[in-house]
Amino acid sequence: GSGIFQLRLQEFVNQRGMLANGQSCEPGCRTFFRICLKHFQATFSEGPCTFGNVSTPVLGTNSFVVRDKNSGSGRNPLQLPFNFTWPGTFSLNIQAWHTPGDDLRPETSPGNSLISQIIIQGSLAVGKIWRTDEQNDTLTRLSYSYRVICSDNYYGESCSRLCKKRDDHFGHYECQPDGSLSCLPGWTGKYCDQPICLSGCHEQNGYCSKPDECICRPGWQGRLCNECIPHNGCRHGTCSIPWQCACDEGWGGLFCDQDLNYCTHHSPCKNGSTCSNSGPKGYTCTCLPGYTGEHCELGLSKCASNPCRNGGSCKDQENSYHCLCPPGYYGQHCEHSTLTCADSPCFNGGSCRERNQGSSYACECPPNFTGSNCEKKVDRCTSNPCANGGQCQNRGPSRTCRCRPGFTGTHCELHISDCARSPCAHGGTCHDLENGPVCTCPAGFSGRRCEVRITHDACASGPCFNGATCYTGLSPNNFVCNCPYGFVGSRCEFPVGLPPSFPWVA
């Protein structure tokens, strides 16, 4: 602790100029004071001034008023500093002395004589307010006031609390009257050394080194550090924890940069054609009649479908076509004939048959020829016989379909089963599902491909009801029940009127 006992001398009256021994001063009492401050004593005794002592120069003769003086000799109020915790009680002895000698240092002069003394004992709290008092004896009167204040940077009731205002990285604070710290705006903590981050800054993912800042830890971003940073290079994905890349719908791959829904994202098929996705960046356009090309971007001639019959020639017009009919035919498509079998209308060895009592005819064409008059060689690809995007190729009198990967059959109508590779070991039954083959394992085996031999047979306990067949290896629980018609449920325990579409997995 550290503080100062301050004593302000105000007025001393010794009208008769007398000493304590009854003698008078000649020519007058040249007065100085000795002050002794010590710990509280019920009865004041001689001995060391434990809290300090001080002397003044000569302040006046006989009676005088003492003016305040802030520096140099004769300073008033008098200062008695202490370096301990102020106990709240004290004893004070003020003695007035006459000196015949030096004004400035009367203490050292021989022949000094006591004029009077006063003793004060009591309690005194630390504070700025002066306590004023006046002491009289038969010859003299002394007016004075006193107080105890804390030294700079000391606070509290006993000046025991050291506090120095600070604004550096070990603290940003001012000192309260009791010596506690009052943090400067933007700072917190016992020593006001912790900055208050930007409001809302994530407690774990963000931090700050100065107020109203929010610095993100690795893997986090955003004003409040509450947004994770996805994997570097993540194109169409998001994260819930840093460095993740969870793909948006329709995207796949490590960086979510493989387009699984090219049709929706890019709409590559033109002119109302149908788009089908087929793996990353793969798609097929199925054109409406009258269009062709990879993206159905090419408009076919209106005459491409050979609408004119009976050898009529087709002429393209702006939005339609016009048939020029050969002699003996009329109608929009030259479908009406003015000819009879007598006119030998059937070409390429076709046989003529009379119709409507000879007013019209019909030609029966030999193989590889077609048309009302057998005038057209058969194009076996016209009817688009190849399914699933297969390519049709004419081969003399016949045609073949070149199938896309994953399809087979004369017309590419068969999907090549994932099960064709017989992926299921140990006699497991293969099921083609959208996401690949699934194996239903016989008793004693499990695993995705029935490759794991299990010592415990999950079917041994007969978990399936109503005559259902039990299989193992299809699920974490190691058995499935394949329900008979009319039953559903994980153990085929519920009767319904609908057949199950796939075995219930237990």
Partner: antibody, heavy 121, light 107 residues
Framework: EVQLQESGPGLVKPSETLSLTCTVS??????????WGWIRQPPGKGLEWIGD???????YYNPSLKSRVTISVDTSKNQFSLKLSSVTAADTAVYYC?????????????WGQGTLVTVSS | LYVLTQPPSVSVSPGQTASITCSGQ??????ASWYQQKPGQSPVLVIY???KRPSGIPERFSGSNSGDTATLTISGTQTMDEADYLC?????????FGGGTKVTVLG
């Protein structure tokens, strides 16, 4: 008990960069109560504070050295490092790392044993 | 630039009191620390926050700080106290050391 250990080359050529690492053991460098400082002492002279760092990466440097100093922290290794660029013979000194305690009002209660770095060609 | 000034040397007889001063502008408004350094060794903190002793430091070491001067006092000085003593304070965000005082214990 907390221990600090400086490591790095004892000889550096003029104009090159001096690099030292301080490894902290027996306590976490990520405590909010401490800063981690570098101090040097040229032969026969007094101490000179170089700079310090908080576990979050906040740094404070001596203005007279600021243009040449970089202090960094690696909390995963419980280490902090000093880099002093463009060195001259005047940078020859014993380099200490120390823990500065907020509770001790910035007093350094733990020091490394020091490592002598000589700048010479 | 904040400067702390110490006398280069102080001599004291065993058992006597040694006082080492450290001067700086308004140093009393800053917290002073004192370090003891023996030849070839790292500094050791002996006083922090003007007058507080870390655990393990003998009671004969005391400190005060007011006005422009901080003082380290070693009462009942022993031969083992012969060392360099350095004061330190913080000026804003910069650590500042005094030049050091060599304490010689006579006899």
């Amino acid at each position: 008990e907390v221990q600090l250990q400086e490591s790095g080359p004892g000889l550096v050529k003029p104009s090159e960069t001096l690099s030292l690492t301080c490894t902290v053991s027996g306590g976490s460098i990520s405590s909010s109560s401490y800063y981690w400082g570098w101090i040097r002492q040229p032969p026969g002279k007094g101490l000179e504070w170089i700079g310090d760092i908080y576990y979050t990466g906040s740094t404070y440097y001596n203005p007279s050295l600021k243009s040449r100093v970089t202090i960094s922290v690696d909390t995963s290794k419980n280490q902090f490092s000093l880099k002093l660029s463009s060195v001259t013979a005047a940078d020859t000194a014993v380099y200490y790392c120390a823990r500065e305690d907020v509770i001790l009002r910035g007093g350094s209660d733990y020091w490394g044993q020091g490592t002598l770095v000589t700048v010479s060609s | 630039l904040y400067v702390l000034t110490q006398p280069p040397s102080v001599s004291v007889s065993p058992g006597q009191t040694a006082s080492i001063t450290c001067s700086g502008q308004r140093l009393g408004d800053k917290y002073a620390s004192w370090y003891q350094q023996k030849p070839g060794q790292s500094p050791v903190l002996v006083i922090y926050e003007d007058s507080k002793r870390p655990s393990g430091i003998p009671e004969r070491f005391s400190g005060s700080n007011s006005g422009d001067t901080a003082t380290l006092t070693i009462s009942g000085t022993q031969t083992m106290d012969e060392a360099d003593y350095l004061c330190q304070a913080w000026d804003r965000d910069t650590g500042v050391f005094g030049g050091g005082t060599k304490v010689t214990v006579l006899g």
